[in-house]
């Protein structure tokens, strides 16, 4: 499996971003197909679960994540995105996606480093 | 590294409350939420609820709704667990771990005893 | 609440061999995990959303499954592995445990 996201993204404060996960495999695609989503925040402390998709999406059921996320993959077009939605600053950090499809070995694990920057406010369009 | 430091053993005869404090370090308190579990000797792990320390918000398991309470003090990076109208069956080690891509890190336990 | 029944509660078994542990949900569940626990210890969580091993956790420790039933799988069993574990599921509240297996040497 090989997997290709954005790299970098950047998404305002309070709005929705789309983290795109994409992948390619040897093996058709079907039930045996797991996507596991997590993060690494900016301040090193312990890696969260955020989503997983087997067969049918599957929320986090604690955590900072906790219907703040959704499935916008499309397996049967190699698509495991994801949706985050009332982005916060401490979503700062590093989103990865890992697919497995076998018997396709797993391949490298995707990362998308997401900043969350501040709303442009009119005086700051104004002094630019 | 993650630490979850919990208060010593209790001793309580039924009726009364116990309250059991976590101290967090190693990481940022308000990032992650806290979950209590308990095990009676020799049993299984049962879940009693968890609590969100950035607002504080809570769910519980509805086996102990209405005697559990769980609060957090984010001054000193530190969660309780208070349990009211205790009584024999309550008698359990109690555990705080913290939800990451699973309960991953937890506490020592903390033995709490009912009897008359 | 969604109920886990493992099986089996209790399993003898030697250094090297390969072992089964299986857990079946009452209801349908979307992932499992798995924690290991020593005596007087906190369980150690094995492997989250059913297949992706914890932090830290050896290679010959693996988990599958859907929907009802699933299973951890040690494929060459170590000295410090002999323990019990638990499952369980979070795809519903509360959270639910299985029974635990508690695995001896034979």
């Known amino acids: 499996v090989e997997i290709y996201t954005s790299r970098v993204l950047e998404a305002v404060n309070g709005t929705d971003a789309r983290l795109k996960c994409t992948f390619s495999s040897f093996a058709p695609v079907g039930d045996a197909l797991t996507v596991t989503w997590n993060f690494r925040p900016l301040d090193g402390g312990p890696e969260q679960f955020v989503f997983y998709y087997h067969i049918d999406p599957f929320q986090p059921m604690s955590g900072r994540f906790k219907d703040r996320v959704s499935w916008d993959g499309n397996p049967e077009r190699y698509d495991a995105s994801i949706l985050l939605w009332k982005l916060q600053f401490d979503d700062n950090g590093t989103y990865t996606c890992q697919v497995k499809n076998p018997p396709d070995v797993d391949g490298v694990i995707g990362e998308i480093r997401l900043s969350v920057v501040h709303t442009v406010r009119f005086s700051e369009i104004h002094f630019l | 590294q993650v630490q979850l430091v919990q208060s010593g053993a209790e001793v309580k005869k039924p009726g009364a409350s116990v309250k059991v404090s976590c101290k967090a370090s190693?990481?940022?308190?308000?990032?992650?939420?806290m979950h209590w579990v308990r095990q009676a000797p020799g049993q299984g792990l049962e879940w009693i609820g968890e609590i969100n320390p950035t607002n504080g918000g809570t769910d519980y398991n509805e086996k102990f709704q209405g005697r559990v309470t769980l609060t957090v003090d984010k001054s000193s990076s530190t969660a309780y667990m208070e349990l009211s109208s205790l009584r024999s069956e309550d008698t359990a080690v109690y555990y705080c771990t913290i939800y990451t891509t699973a309960l991953d890190y937890w506490g020592q336990g903390t033995l709490v005893t009912v009897s008359s | 609440d969604i109920q886990l029944t493992q099986s089996p509660s209790f399993l003898s078994a030697s250094v090297g061999d390969r072992v089964t542990i299986t857990c079946r949900a009452s209801s349908s569940v979307g992932y499992m995990y798995w924690y290991q626990q020593k005596p007087g210890k906190a369980p150690k969580p094995l492997i989250y959303v059913t297949s992706n091993l914890a932090s830290g956790v050896p290679s010959r420790f693996s988990g599958s499954g859907s929907g009802t039933e699933y299973t951890l799988t040690i494929s060459s069993l170590q000295p410090e592995d002999f323990a019990t574990y638990y499952c369980q599921q979070w795809s519903s509240n509360p959270p639910t445990f299985g029974q635990g297996t508690k695995l001896e040497i034979k």
């Open positions: 190693g990481y940022t308190f308000t990032n992650y939420w």
